[in-house]
């Protein structure tokens, strides 16, 4: 970019140096050099001269046009080329942009996750505006009326501690650019009803040598959350197809659940839950690996998820995570 | 703002087959698996199928092998084939967008369809 260039004269841009992308717009240029009527005056867009749409206005000043501008960011500058000179002299420069003003923010969606201390705020930014966009996400009390500002450039993560106006509030964003201001929706939220539970983490997995062989997974979360509705999802690796089943789940002990699996076949287990009754999910837990055995009764911990096999433990590959994705796009 | 519009409920014999339809519309800027939900009367909702971001499928065990879910992406629409329809599959099948955590941390609000009305006789 330019900056602290020692100007000989001025560079100036209409309709403005920040302007809507696609705009048509004219890039002044005025000498004023001490000793220099300019035989030719000269512009530079990121480096590169310049050679189409100049006009010169008079002795001192020269315009530059482009039709549908869609560049987010150039450098401009100038240059005069004056008598008795070998070289051309600065005139001014400037840093252009152009983008967009910000679209409405919607799916505004502020959620706590247990122990975090955080309520962390996000919504849809809508299209990509290309300049500098700020946020200010406003929190006010539904109690108190009392109301809280926090400027951000993404999503928000606020203190609880510093909600203090009780447990029903109202979030709304704004967001502004050099091009114009829009605000949300107001959501509507109450603390107790926007935490979603300590991780559910799946611990190890044991296949039981019986008449039909089952296979236990033991699970757990540190959540304090009495109620909880959990979603155990689990299938072959080789296979497309996940099964689920659903627990209502007390974590004042490990759980245990009880599947029924073919013999030989590795298999993968993922875990979610949330407060019974309420809005948000878990991530599906990391990815948890169990090889059924042939016929020898087996353990599976997460303390071995990786790829090592012997006669006694029989372990399996790595976790991994399940999926997540930022990328904007239509449903579907 | 994303919405669901499901489609397709209706009374049927015992043995017989039903497909239903979830067609979503809206810009999002989140990742969703599409998910189908069934509440009986004085039951509580209960998870059916879904259709994973990531191309996998998911199945309840009561509709396993039963129940088929697919997916039309240039149509934006979620379908549940039922056949082998049973009494016990009564219930209100609503669809819902399940959304993916984001990097930041942050939430993708999840979506409800209003539900359409599945009544198997015997």
């Known amino acids: 970019g330019i900056t602290n260039i020692n100007c000989s004269g001025h560079i100036w841009v209409e309709p403005a140096t920040i302007f809507k992308m696609g705009m048509n717009i004219s890039i002044y240029c005025q000498a004023a050099i001490k000793n220099c009527q300019p035989r030719k005056l000269h512009f530079y867009k990121n480096g590169i001269k310049e050679r189409f749409q100049i006009t010169r206005i008079n002795k001192t000043t020269a315009r530059l046009w482009y039709k549908n501008f869609l560049e987010p960011h150039a450098s401009m500058y100038c240059t005069a080329e004056c008598p008795k000179h070998f070289q051309e002299t600065l005139i001014c420069g400037k840093d252009i942009s152009s983008g967009y003003p910000p679209d409405i923010p919607d799916e505004v969606t502020c959620v706590i996750y247990e122990y975090s201390g955080n309520m962390t705020c996000t919504w849809n930014a809508g299209k990509l505006t290309y300049i500098d966009t700020k946020y200010v996400v406003h929190v006010k009390s539904l109690e108190t009326e009392e109301e809280q500002q926090y400027l951000t450039s993404s999503y928000i993560n606020i203190s609880t501690d510093s909600l203090q106006g009780g447990k029903k509030y109202l979030v709304w964003v704004q967001a502004a650019n050099a091009l114009g201001m829009e605000e949300s929706k107001q959501l509507q939220i109450h603390l107790d009803d926007i935490v979603i539970p300590s991780a559910a983490v799946i611990s190890r997995a044991e296949t039981i040598n019986a008449t039909v062989p089952k296979t236990i997974i033991y699970w757990d979360s540190q959540t304090t959350i009495e109620k909880v509705s959990c979603e155990m999802r689990y299938k072959a690796t080789t296979n497309q197809t996940w099964n689920v089943k659903e627990f209502d789940t007390n974590f004042t002990y490990v759980q245990q659940s009880e599947f029924y699996l073919e013999p030989n076949i590795k298999y993968v287990f993922q875990v979610r839950c949330q407060e019974t009754g309420k809005r948000y999910w878990q991530p599906w837990s990391s990815l948890f690996f169990h090889k059924t055995p042939e016929t020898v009764p087996q353990v599976t911990s997460k303390a071995f998820q990786h790829d090592t096999w012997n006669s006694g433990l029989t372990v399996a590959s790595i976790s991994t995570g399940h999926l997540t994705s930022d990328n904007r796009g239509d449903i579907g | 703002q994303v919405q669901l519009q499901e489609s397709g409920g209706g009374s049927v014999q015992a043995g017989g087959s039903l497909r239903l339809s979830c067609a979503a519309s809206?810009?999002?800027?989140?990742?969703?698996?599409m998910s189908w939900y069934r509440q009986a009367p004085g039951k509580k909702r209960e998870f059916v199928s879904a259709?994973?971001?990531?191309?996998?499928?998911s199945y309840a065990d009561s509709v396993k092998g039963r129940f088929t879910i697919s997916q039309d992406k240039a149509k934006n629409t979620v379908y549940l084939q039922m056949n082998s329809l049973k009494p016990e599959d009564t219930a209100m099948y609503y669809c819902?967008?399940?959304?993916?955590?984001?990097?930041?941390?942050?939430?993708?609000?999840?979506?409800w369809g209003q539900g359409t009305q599945v009544t198997v006789s015997s």
């Open positions: 819902k967008t399940d959304p993916h955590v984001q990097s930041s941390g942050g939430y993708c609000p999840p979506y």
């Open positions: 259709f994973n971001s990531d191309g996998t499928t």
């Open positions: 809206g810009y999002t800027y989140c990742s969703y698996d």
